[in-house]
Interface confidence: low
Amino acid sequence: IWELKKDVYVVELDWYPDAPGEMVVLTCDTPEEDGITWTLDQSSEVLGSGKTLTIQVKEFGDAGQYTCHKGGEVLSHSLLLLHKKEDGIWSTDILKDQKEPKNKTFLRCEAKNYSGRFTCWWLTTISTDLTFSVKSSRGSSDPQGVTCGAATLSAERVRGDNKEYEYSVECQEDSACPAAEESLPIEVMVDAVHKLKYENYTSSFFIRDIIKPDPPKNLQLKPLKNSRQVEVSWEYPDTWSTPHSYFSLTFCVQVQGKSKREKKDRVFTDKTSATVICRKNASISVRAQDRYYSSSWSEWASVPCS
Amino acid sequence: RAVPGGSSPAWTQCQQLSQKLCTLAWSAHPLVGHMDLREEGDEETTNDVPHIQCGDGCDPQGLRDNSQFCLQRIHQGLIFYEKLLGSDIFTGEPSLLPDSPVAQLHASLLGLSQLLQPEGHHWETQQIPSLSPSQPWQRLLLRFKILRSLQAFVAVAARVFAHGAATLSP
């Protein structure tokens, strides 16, 4: 058993049929010694008396808010949550496996630049009685500070018969150094509580590996005289790190016909313009990637040829 | 070339070669699918590699103030990785093809380090830890780790030279 926060405790249980469970001793936070009784949740049934209460925690029915009283007055509370371990593996019932980029990916994180700011998100099908708490640091043995906001519900989707809820959190490294080469990874820890079930999820990454620039902005076409060619121009996204002479992007320009089956023409360039042939009913798209490190490409920015 | 006393390197040449290094580092060990989640892995072996850290003056402001600190750090790293790629970690079994990207990477590291430091002038270089294991498969693991670290190192070096070529070239 360990303390998650004041008056909230997590009991770690090996979860299998007829498991013995864990013996837990609760102590009433009071100077009083006599006349103390204990109850669980809203029940008025007295579970025991005395300053301490010893219970055998085996299942969710044994978890909940234990309260000690004296003469009708509440003295203190202890909320017990359960963390299940089945076949040596901690349960992951609360969050959905996103399976990208690999199985058992519950948290996904992205950064738009090297400022030390990043966003993580996760999915669940649970709609109520759900709380999340997020902590982060750079490195684990001698951790350096990363500040995370509160996790918020950022999207709802219908997937077949189920509703899926996306939560996200923004974090910022306290003393970010955008130009340095990272040697210690960022660690992100999410505590999830659903009713009386506790679970924790972690992710570890270098910012450079989760970089995904925003799409290029101000994508424009300028027809060239007496030619089917057009000059495509664009600008770095506002959210990208500056100066651009240092934090450079490379770009991919694609000409795509109306039909997905039509051959795509692609040009790669470090410049912010390119000359391409604009076919009728085609569209021109541009995306960006860090010029010197192969992290993710941005989403496409597109304009129609016409 | 960086001349003793601190005159400027050939920024544009360094920019071109460092960008080539980035390309080669990724072709030597391409992205097999980016992993967010950390799993098992003994990490002691590449913690000794030189990193370009916050106080090394490799940020745009530091380069403007005095690029020599940063260039010295980059030079140290280039020599370090050049020695690693020339060591039996990469030359021993299991053997790589002579024209593999690793061989080209090795030559380019040497080329860039020579651009930064002419003969006869010696910056202090970092001692290479005795990493080389006798077993071929352990060499294989080290290759993975070294190339991943090198990709991060040359990315920062390439940014430095790109910025220098754009803003500090005479």
Epitope: - | L37, R38, E40, D42, P94, L97, S134, L140, F144, S149
Partner: antibody, heavy 126, light 108 residues
Framework: QVELVQSGAEVKKPGSSVKVSCKAS????????ISWVRQAPGQGLEWMGI???????WYAQKFQGRVTITADESTSTAYMELSSLRSEDTAVYYC????????????????????WGQGTLVTVSS | DIVLTQSPATLSLSPGERATLSCRAS???????LAWYQQKPGQAPRLLIY???RRATGVPARFSGSGSGTDFTLTISSLEPEDFATYYC?????????FGQGTKVEIK
């Protein structure tokens, strides 16, 4: 879920060769980490060799010159060919995938085998 | 080559009993490079423990590994009927990767 599916049992004459295949189905395939292990009837396990990224292929000294391990990424299939067969090569041959470890977010093989094919019995008899 | 010697060759126990299997190496093996497998007749081996003490995915908590240098142990705290099988240790410190000759855990 990834599965390694091996080719069927073979009966071979002494002096001939056998080629066993191992196809990955239901997930991404990395031939870079496929090892071959054999087990003679009633005996223990014996590692033969591996196909490894950043280092081609290498073999246990005992099989050097007789075994060839290859892979075809396009069909997600690894192959093990053993030549100059003798009666003591009668065994079940397994392909096995190395468990992957991580370094700073990148995978590499640990050479401990977390996924195995069902095995292919090769009988060498005149 | 590193030779791994497992003992005992056979272990006769009843369900619920504790099983202790030993694996001794002819030269020192980094604990990062020792694994244990379980094999049942007619089946492929299954990875139980790697890094000498870390349980592989889905392996029950009753299995645990320990040891370093040349002496390693696999412990099954309370035998279940499905645990009766042959167990192999494997080192991946040096090539060729070698396996022990196996310990058969049978029902008494």
């Amino acid at each position: 879920q990834v599965e390694l599916v091996q080719s069927g049992a073979e009966v071979k004459k002494p002096g001939s060769s056998v080629k066993v295949s191992c196809k990955a189905s239901g997930g991404t395939f990395s031939s870079n980490y496929i090892s071959w292990v054999r087990q003679a009837p009633g005996q223990g396990l014996e590692w033969m060799g591996i196909n490894a990224h950043l280092g081609g292929t290498w073999y246990a000294q005992k099989f050097q010159g007789r075994v060839t391990i290859t892979a075809d990424e396009s069909t997600s299939t690894a192959y093990m060919e053993l030549s100059s067969l003798r009666s003591e090569d009668t065994a079940v041959y397994y392909c096995a995938r190395s468990k992957k470890g991580m370094y700073g977010g990148w995978t590499y093989p640990l050479m401990m085998f977390d996924l195995w094919g069902q095995g292919t019995l090769v009988t060498v008899s005149s | 080559d590193i030779v791994l010697t497992q003992s005992p060759a056979t272990l006769s126990l009843s369900p619920g009993e504790r099983a202790t299997l030993s694996c001794r190496a002819s030269q020192s093996v980094s604990s990062n490079y020792l694994a244990w497998y379980q094999q049942k007749p007619g089946q492929a081996p299954r990875l139980l423990i790697y890094y000498a003490s870390r349980r592989a995915t889905g392996v029950p908590a009753r299995f645990s590994g320990s040891g370093s240098g040349t002496d390693f142990t696999l412990t099954i705290s309370s035998l279940e009927p499905e645990d009766f099988a042959t167990y192999y240790c494997q080192q991946t410190s040096n090539t060729p990767f070698t396996f022990g000759q196996g310990t058969k855990v049978e029902i008494k």
